[in-house]
C-alpha cells in the first residue's frame, strides 16, 4: 500500500497541516524566525474550526499568530488575503494602542486568553504556534 505521510515528532496533524505548539515565549519576530527555520510559518487562522483547534491545544494563553501590520496593511505571513479572510478580533480591536509608552503602536496579532485576537507590541514575549503543510516541516 501507499506510505502515509505524517507530521514530524512533537507536531500535531489537523486538516492536512502540521502544528507545533511552543511551551516557551518569544517576541513576534523571533517566533516568526523560529517557524521559518522549521520550514514552517506562524499559524494562519482561516476558519472557526482551525481557531478552535489551536485554542484547545494552547489553552488560555497569549499566543502569537502569523498576522502583522509591521509593513503597513494587515497581512498574513503566508500571503493569505486578510481582507476577505476569517477574522476573530476581540471587540474594539485592533486599536494600535500607544498608551504602553514603549514607542509606536501595536503591530502584531495574538490570541488572548479567551481566543479572540488582539494587536500588541511585537516585542512582548508570548507563546507561539508554527504551521506547515503535511510533509513539509523539518
Amino acid at each position: 500500500g501507499s506510505e502515509r505521510i505524517c507530521c514530524p515528532i512533537n507536531w500535531v496533524e489537523y486538516e492536512g497541516s502540521c502544528y507545533w505548539f511552543s511551551s516557551s515565549v518569544k517576541p513576534w519576530t523571533e517566533a516568526d524566525k523560529y517557524c521559518q527555520l522549521e520550514n514552517a510559518h506562524l499559524v494562519v487562522v482561516t476558519s472557526w474550526e482551525e481557531q478552535r483547534f489551536v485554542q484547545q491545544h494552547m489553552g488560555p494563553l497569549n499566543t502569537w499568530i502569523g498576522l502583522t501590520d509591521q509593513n503597513g496593511p494587515w497581512k498574513w505571513v503566508d500571503g493569505t488575503d486578510y481582507e476577505t479572510g476569517f477574522k476573530n478580533w476581540r471587540p474594539g480591536q485592533p486599536d494600535d494602542w500607544y498608551g504602553h509608552g514603549l514607542g509606536g503602536g501595536e503591530d502584531c496579532a495574538h490570541f488572548t486568553t479567551d481566543g479572540h485576537w488582539n494587536d500588541d507590541v511585537c516585542r512582548r514575549p508570548y507563546r507561539w504556534v508554527c504551521e506547515t503543510e503535511l510533509g513539509k516541516a523539518n
Epitope: 509591521q70 494587515w74 486578510y82 481582507e83 474594539g92 486599536d95 494602542w97 514607542g103 509606536g104 503602536g105
Partner: antibody, heavy 117, light 107 residues
Framework: EVQLVESGGGLVKPGGSLRLSCAAS????????MNWVRQAPGKGLEWVSS????????YYADSVKGRFTISRDNAKNSLYLQMNSLRAEDTAVYFC??????????WGQGTLVTVSS | DIQMTQSPSSLSASVGDRVTITCRAS??????LNWYQQKPGKAPKLLIY???SLQSGVPSRFSGSGSGTDFTLTISSLQPEDFATYYC?????????FGPGTKVDIK
C-alpha cells in the same frame, strides 16, 4: 484598490463650522487607525487628529483641541472631521490618511477649507 | 511634544546626483521615523517607514537610515521625477509631528 476620497471643504466665515468626510474603499476599514493632516497654502504638513479602528483612542493636535472632533462610522467606511469655531489659520488643504506608527499610506487627494470673512 | 527639524530646507541638484537629507528629533524616537515625498498640488506619498523600510512600489534609489534622534534620507541617483519636497515625520508618540520639509529643485 485601496482608496480615500475627501469631501466637504469650502469657504466658511470665521467662527463658522464645517464637516469633512473621507470615504474609504478597498480595505477592512475597521482594522485601521485613520488620520487627518492639513497643509496651509505654501506651508508644510501638520498632523491634526487620529482615531483608532474602533474609536477607542482619539488624539488631537493642541491647535485644534476643543474645536475639532474626529469620528468614524465603520459600517459606512467613513471618517469625519467636525470643525467648529473656525479661524483664519485653519485655512488649509485637509487630507485623510490611513495608518499609524508605520507611516501614513494611502492619502486622499485633499479638500480645501478656506476660512475668510 | 517632539520637535522635528530638517536640513537643508532646500537644495539644488542635477539628475544623477546623490542627495542626502537629514532629520533630527528633539528626543529619541527609536526607529519610528517616516519619510514622505510631495509634489505641488498632490498628496504626500510614503517613501520610507520605521527609518529604513522601503515602502512597496518605491524605487530602490531611495533609502533611509538612522535611529534615536538622527535620521537620513538618501537618493542615490536623482531622477527627473524626484524633484519635490520631502518631509520626515515621527510616529513614536502623540502628537505626531512633521519636519518643516526639504525642497529639492533643479540646479
Amino acid at each position: 484598490e485601496v482608496q480615500l476620497v475627501e469631501s466637504g471643504g469650502g469657504l466658511v466665515k470665521p467662527g463658522g463650522s464645517l464637516r469633512l468626510s473621507c470615504a474609504a474603499s478597498g480595505f477592512t476599514f475597521s482594522s485601521y487607525s485613520m488620520n487627518w493632516v492639513r497643509q496651509a497654502p505654501g506651508k508644510g504638513l501638520e498632523w491634526v487628529s487620529s482615531i483608532s479602528g474602533s474609536s477607542s483612542y482619539i488624539y488631537y493636535a493642541d491647535s485644534v483641541k476643543g474645536r475639532f472632533t474626529i469620528s468614524r462610522d465603520n459600517a459606512k467606511n467613513s471618517l469625519y472631521l467636525q470643525m467648529n469655531s473656525l479661524r483664519a489659520e485653519d485655512t488649509a488643504v485637509y487630507f485623510c490618511a490611513r495608518g499609524g506608527s508605520r507611516g501614513f499610506d494611502p492619502w486622499g487627494q485633499g479638500t480645501l477649507v478656506t476660512v475668510s470673512s | 511634544d517632539i520637535q522635528m527639524t530638517q536640513s537643508p530646507s532646500s537644495l539644488s541638484a542635477s539628475v544623477g546626483d546623490r542627495v542626502t537629507i537629514t532629520c533630527r528629533a528633539s528626543q529619541s524616537i527609536t526607529s519610528y521615523l517616516n519619510w514622505y515625498q510631495q509634489k505641488p498640488g498632490k498628496a504626500p506619498k510614503l517613501l520610507i517607514y520605521t527609518a529604513s523600510s522601503l515602502q512597496s512600489g518605491v524605487p530602490s534609489r531611495f533609502s533611509g537610515s538612522g535611529s534615536g534622534t538622527d535620521f537620513t534620507l538618501t537618493i542615490s541617483s536623482l531622477q527627473p521625477e524626484d524633484f519635490a519636497t520631502y518631509y520626515c515625520q515621527q510616529s513614536h508618540s502623540f502628537p505626531f509631528t512633521f519636519g518643516p520639509g526639504t525642497k529639492v529643485d533643479i540646479k
